[in-house]
């Protein structure tokens, strides 16, 4: 058993909130059985831990929010892995169980005498974890004990099902929303025939399912749908690319409900096979505006349109975070490990000194160097504030006119807290309204990004639009520069006057051949020619019939 998993970050308080962050990378395939996690993570790990600690400080110093009540936390490492996260969640539960037994005077020592020790306070709710599949596993456990869970980046549609995940809420929208946003982009540019790719796993599969369902309703045809593992080998990506080329030149747009590394695999295959510029990739938020997806393969990615969750940087977090140093930061038990990993040096004389690094860390090191704020920072902070506002509303209704925790609120009832959380409505860290629908989901707000060549060998993501609660806004001129540049992704062109569509057996409804109606026929509907009745003839526009004027012949008339 790896001891790193046992490390917990504590912050004392009257009410304790649990949190699961991926402080370390998931275990490698050969280490899964012993649940040994990978390297320490900055954005998804350390930054989120510090966000929790600092946000709680801000809440505790706000006189209008939970006055006379101090919020504390217990932060555990999920390692982006279900087994590790479950194990850590059991620790949360165990604390709760011991605490509730103690409330009822049930704590006894082995010899039968009463216990005088005070156990840890119960966890009233949990923030996180990041991954949908891990969040599902954690929720399956937490809901048994009525412990509300608020996620900051688990977007799977499955989690909207309240019959299965009653105590789950999130400050991010369900993937159904971004599937809708992707369909709206496809519709905007009249792409009626597209190929589809998704990453194997919950995120890709449920997202693509929604994309296909919505596309069908909008008359968009999927040329073919393919799935691939993110860690698939080169040959698998090569085969997938060749399959996609078989639908060219008609299906030029490839809708990819993919994790970032799946997109990178596709770009690498494009380079190998000589297929740069053949497709326009429409990517989900797994790609968003990540440079680790496109680095080294920018030419292949050019033109890509991606969906990104709307979440501006949080300035006050950087002001706090960038001043942190290992000499003074003792409350984050992973910080020394992270510092050494980040700067590839040894913290000499520190409790967690890592001898694998030869170089000693010097005092001039600063987190300002190559700093990138976690793209989901705003969501992490909003999730913490949601828990605080939920507790605040609960205190207001259970303890009217009372500052602090009244008896009616002790111990905190998870059912009542969930009720209160679902009614939460406040202004989030970026100025947007945070609220939850009946499924515990938040509204969908996305930015539309376009990966462009900005100059010679200089590429970047440009914000070209937004999708807010069903409304798509796009700067078409920024994406295409001129109307004639808009890529076409259609199976068949519209038929000419007097022609009908003939769909070949086994073909999708977007693919047809145009056949002219016979001389005495008119176009009844787009698929049918109908003969005019005797005595009538097709109109000039071939949309109906006109009676043939009767001409009476007389003896003296010349032959016609």
């Amino acid at each position: 058993q790896s001891s790193e998993r046992r490390v917990v970050a504590h912050m004392p308080g009257d009410i304790i909130i649990g949190a699961l962050f991926s402080v370390h990378h998931q275990p490698t395939v050969d280490k899964v059985h012993e649940r040994k996690c990978g390297a320490v993570r900055e954005q998804y790990g350390i930054q989120r831990v510090e966000a929790m600690l600092h946000t709680l400080e801000r809440i505790n110093s706000d006189p209008t929010l939970l006055p006379n009540i101090t919020l504390g936390c217990e932060i555990r490492d999920s390692c982006w892995h279900s087994a590790v996260a479950l194990e850590q969640s059991i620790e949360f539960i165990r604390d709760s169980l011991i605490s509730s037994e103690e409330e009822e005077g049930l704590v006894r020592c082995v010899d039968g005498s009463s216990s005088s020790f005070r156990s840890k306070k119960p966890i009233v709710g949990v923030i996180g974890p990041g991954s949908s599949s891990v969040a599902i596993q954690v929720q399956n456990l937490l809901q048994l004990f009525n412990i509300p869970q608020i996620a900051y980046s688990a977007t799977s549609m499955d989690l909207s099902d309240k019959t299965l995940f009653k105590y789950f809420m999130r400050v991010v929208p369900s993937d159904a929303q971004q599937a809708r946003a992707m369909v709206d982009i496809v519709k905007r540019y009249n792409w009626t025939y597209v190929s589809a790719v998704h990453t194997e796993g919950n995120y890709g599969e449920s997202g693509m399912e929604a994309f296909k369902d919505m596309s069908a309703k909008e008359g968009i045809c999927i040329a073919h749908s393919y799935k691939i593992y993110s860690n698939a080998g080169e040959q698998s990506f090569d085969k997938l690319l060749k399959k996609l080329t078989s639908h060219l030149p008609k299906a030029r747009v490839v809708a990819c409900f993919c994790e970032g590394m799946t997109v990178r695999g596709l770009l690498m295959a494009m380079r190998r096979l000589g297929l740069a510029g053949e497709f326009l990739l429409l990517g989900s938020d797994g790609w968003a505006d990540r440079y680790d997806v496109t680095d080294g393969y920018q030419r292949e990615a050019v033109g890509g349109i991606t969906i990104k969750l709307q979440s501006p940087d949080v300035k006050w977090f950087d002001d706090y975070y960038l001043k942190l140093r290992p000499e003074t930061n003792h409350r984050n038990p992973w910080f020394q490990e992270f510092w050494q990993h980040r700067f590839q040096c040894r913290l000499e004389g520190f409790p967690q000194e890592n001898s694998k690094y030869n170089k000693t860390c010097n005092s001039s090191l600063t987190l300002k160097t190559h700093h990138v704020q976690d793209s989901k920072m705003g969501f992490v902070i909003n999730a913490i504030y949601s828990m605080a506002y939920g507790l605040h509303n609960m205190q207001m209704s259970l303890c009217p006119g009372y500052a602090g925790l009244c008896d009616a609120m002790k111990p905190i009832d998870g059912r009542k807290l969930l009720e209160s959380l679902m009614k939460t409505n406040f202004t989030g860290v970026s100025g947007d309204t945070i609220l939850f629908d009946e499924n515990g989901d938040s509204p969908g707000r996305y930015e539309i990004m376009n990966f462009k060549e900005m100059g010679k060998d200089y590429f970047d993501y440009i914000n070209v639009g937004s999708w807010d609660n069903g409304e798509l806004k796009m700067d078409d001129d920024e994406v295409w520069s001129k109307k004639s540049n808009i890529i076409r992704s259609v199976c068949s062109e519209p038929c000419e006057k007097g022609q009908i569509k003939v769909i070949r057996k086994g073909e999708v409804s977007c693919c047809w051949t145009c056949t002219p109606c016979k001389e005495n026929e008119y176009v009844f509907d787009e698929y049918t020619c109908k003969a005019c009745q005797l005595g009538s003839w097709p109109t000039d526009d071939l949309t109906g019939c006109d009676l043939i004027p009767v001409q009476y012949l007389r003896w003296g008339d010349p032959e016609p």
Epitope: Q235, D238, K239, K242, T245, S246, L248, P249, R252, R271, R272, L273, G274, L275, G277, E278
Partner: antibody
Framework: SLEESGGRLVTPGTPLTLTCTVS????????VGWVRQAPGKGLEYIGI?????NTWYASWVKGRFTISKTSTTVDLKLASLTTEDTATYFC?????????????WGPGTLVTVSS | AYDMTQTPASVEVAVGGTVTIKCQAS??????LAWYQQKPGQPPKLLIY???DLASGVPSRFKGSGSGTEYTLTISGVQCDDAATYYC????????????FGGGTEVVVK
């Protein structure tokens, strides 16, 4: 069908343009490649123009040859020819819109480079 | 990248016999392989694509097999008309390639 033209006897250093004229083939749907064959030798791939208009070349070409197209023709521009470029030049229609197999070939046009 | 090696360079076979031609790719081409037949003074003719699929109008005595890096063309019940040079071609990649064709195998029918 496809038919190559423009092959002739030239002196080293002379540029030359070969034309592949297609009929009954939609060049916006199919790729067209160029392949050459020196007398008594094997087939040598030169390059391809995709339905999209994107071009790819064999690594030995190194900018000496250029492929372009109109709606009914595909041109191969040969810059500064050497005696090694003496060969029959074939154009061939691809199986699809990008690089794949060549399922329809022209009869070829002979280019002779000699001083 | 994706170099094609064809063996043998030449083979003699009696009418009614069987001939086997091998083609090896320098790295996996995932069954994207074609075989062509070329007779003197004529352009090549596609026989087999995707390693084993027969092109239209090609007699069933021509059979393609293989995967990964190793591929084989087998002609059984050889006829006089089969005397020609046979080429393999990788149909996977066109980026950074020297030649997509193998060196060719001359089949002489006795």
């Amino acid at each position: 069908s496809l038919e190559e033209s423009g092959g002739r006897l030239v002196t080293p250093g002379t540029p030359l343009t070969l034309t592949c004229t297609v009929s009954g083939i939609d060049l916006s749907s199919y790729a067209v490649g160029w392949v050459r064959q020196a007398p008594g030798k094997g087939l040598e791939y030169i390059g391809i123009i995709y339905a999209s208009g994107n071009t790819w070349y064999a690594s030995w070409v190194k900018g000496r040859f250029t492929i372009s197209k109109t709606s009914t023709t595909v041109d191969l521009k040969l810059a500064s020819l050497t005696t090694e470029d003496t060969a029959t030049y074939f154009c061939a229609r691809g199986h699809g819109a990008t690089y794949d197999y060549f399922n329809l070939w022209g009869p070829g046009t002979l280019v002779t480079v000699s001083s | 990248a994706y170099d094609m090696t064809q063996t043998p360079a030449s083979v003699e076979v009696a009418v009614g016999g069987t001939v086997t031609i091998k083609c090896q790719a320098s790295q996996s081409i995932s069954s994207y392989l074609a075989w062509y037949q070329q007779k003197p003074g004529q352009p090549p003719k596609l026989l087999i694509y995707d390693a084993s699929d027969l092109a239209s109008g090609v007699p069933s005595r021509f059979k393609g097999s293989g995967s990964g890096t190793e591929y084989t063309l087998t002609i059984s019940g050889v006829q006089c008309d089969d005397a020609a040079t046979y080429y393999c071609q990788q149909g996977l990649a066109t980026a950074n390639v020297d030649n997509v064709f193998g060196g060719g195998t001359e089949v002489v029918v006795k």
